[in-house]
């Protein structure tokens, strides 16, 4: 049998190398960059995905006002350190020994420091606000239809339980999706809101992480919903610690 015939691939993560060398000749997949085994029946953690991405060849009014403590990922891509479970390590450092603390979605939450910087714990991001602007349409989408479709998307495509989709707000053309998941709410096996948000972000950008599964086909009552810009805000269980210099910049 060829690999194509056996279809030994990871449907949930195209950034993997798979081979039928698992127990009983079963397909086993490892993330690029880290070489860690991944569970292809669910989403791969954002940390492993970022690490794989960095290792890959380079190519090409009802609306919510984010809190003063909301973080936006302004630092962009970096090659993260992941723990054995695939989560971000609380302290991240670059090759020049510059270090910083991150939250559970890998976004910097302190000023940058040196190797003496301590990050005592990985602080959980418990609230994610996804702010979207959709392309012009003939008319506004029906709010309840839009709400149902986005909840369905997070349940069916990203396997995120609907209870973690706290709200969907809409004021044409702005859509806001609120994801909430406290440490106490997240059971073993539940998809993490940070991972679901990252898969969604990549889908919206036309960079789907799914293997072989088509790109995002988002429709509301048959009408395509096309997103032209995305902003994601992250709120941590413990507010971030930045110096006043940054806050006034």
């Amino acid at each position: 049998h060829t690999a194509a015939q056996d279809n030994c691939t990871c449907p949930t993560n195209k950034m993997t190398v798979c081979s039928p060398d698992g127990p009983g000749g079963r397909c086993q997949c490892r993330a690029l960059g880290s070489g860690m085994a991944v569970d292809c029946s669910t989403l791969t953690s954002k940390c492993l995905l970022l690490k794989a991405r960095m290792s890959a060849p380079k190519n090409a009014r009802t609306l919510v006002r984010p809190s003063e403590h909301a973080l936006v990922d302004n630092d962009g891509l970096y090659d993260p350190d992941c723990d054995p479970e695939g989560r971000f390590k609380a302290r991240q450092c670059n090759q020049t020994s510059v270090c910083w603390c991150v939250n559970s979605v890998g976004v910097r939450r302190t000023d940058k420091g040196d190797l003496s910087l301590r990050c005592d714990e990985l602080v959980r991001t418990h609230h994610i606000l996804i702010d979207l602007r959709h392309r012009p349409t003939a008319g506004a989408f029906n709010h309840s239809d839009l709400d149902a479709e986005l909840r369905r998307l997070f349940r069916e495509r990203y396997r995120l339980h609907p209870k973690f989709v706290a709200a969907v707000h809409y004021e044409q053309p702005t859509i806001q999706i609120e994801l909430r998941q406290n440490t106490s709410q997240k059971a073993a096996g539940d998809v993490d809101i940070g991972d679901a948000a990252y898969y969604f972000e990549r889908d919206i950008k036309g960079e789907s992480l799914f293997q072989g599964r088509g790109g995002l086909d988002l429709r509301v009552r048959g009408e395509p919903l096309q997103v032209e810009r995305t902003l994601i805000y992250y709120l941590d269980e413990i507010p971030p610690k930045f110096s006043m210099k940054r806050l006034t910049a």
């Epitope: 069916e156 072989g212 429709r219």
Partner: antibody, heavy 116, light 108 residues
Framework: QVQLQESGPGLVKPSGTLSLTCAVS?????????WSWVRQPPGKGLEWIGE???????DYFPSLKSRVTISVDKSKNQFSLKLSSVTAADTAVYYC?????????WGQGTLVTVSS | DIVLTQSPGTLSLSPGERATLSCRAS???????LAWYQQKPGQAPRLLIS???SRATGIPDRFSGSGSGTDFTLTISRLEPEDFAVYYC?????????FGQGTKVEIK
């Protein structure tokens, strides 16, 4: 490799309650998947009955909702189906399945006959 | 609820031929939420395709899926003897999953 195994009585009396259990092995029921029941009357097509998440959240097919209860027992890694007030029309092969971008793992099915 | 209608009801073909099975939805279904199954007599169904076009693990590449909106297609490029079975489409784009009534692919 995830495996599912249905068990329960093969014969139920009319107006009685059909009770089946699905044991999950090779994987945890406390995963991001939903767990479904599907049935197939003799010589007919597939009918979805309903499904459950490990926290006990459920979805049921509307026409069966008033008669169906699906429950989960995480300690035993199993989930169960109860269908009340059964008639001959409920005679079918009953399957349990994992719902993960389609039903990717199925039990072998168990035939339940409703007859006095 | 979304009703799925499969056609034809029966397809009579010879091994080596191409099989084209159709599934039409009563209302638009995102292609992310359509699956195809194969069922042989006395066996449980087997997932072939999810997300309208993504082959499930272990499914040979002669099986392919396509379509969007209300029209979806399962194609078997060259029928092998083991492919003669009943095929079902299924949508999971609403909280209530529904199946088509099935297409039987039989030996001519």
């Amino acid at each position: 490799q995830v495996q599912l195994q249905e068990s329960g009585p093969g014969l139920v009396k009319p107006s009685g309650t059909l009770s089946l259990t699905c044991a999950v092995s090779g994987g945890s029921i406390s995963s991001s998947n939903w767990w479904s029941w599907v049935r197939q009357p003799p010589g007919k097509g597939l009918e979805w009955i309903g499904e459950i998440y490990h926290d006990g959240s459920t979805d049921y097919f509307p026409s069966l909702k008033s008669r169906v209860t699906i429950s989960v027992d995480k300690s035993k890694n199993q989930f169960s189906l109860k269908l009340s007030s059964v008639t001959a029309a409920d005679t079918a092969v009953y399957y349990c399945a994992r719902d993960n971008w389609g039903f990717d793992y199925w039990g072998q099915g168990t035939l339940v006959t409703v007859s006095s | 609820d979304i009703v799925l209608t499969q056609s034809p009801g029966t397809l009579s073909l010879s091994p080596g031929e191409r099989a084209t099975l159709s599934c039409r939805a009563s209302q638009s279904v995102s292609s992310s939420y359509l699956a195809w199954y194969q069922q042989k007599p006395g066996q449980a169904p087997r997932l072939l395709i999810s997300g309208a076009s993504s082959r499930a693990t272990g499914i040979p590449d002669r099986f392919s899926g396509s379509g969007s909106g209300t029209d979806f297609t399962l194609t078997i490029s060259r029928l092998e003897p083991e492919d003669f079975a009943v095929y079902y489409c299924q949508q999971y784009g609403s909280s209530h999953r529904t199946f088509g009534q099935g297409t039987k692919v039989e030996i001519k």
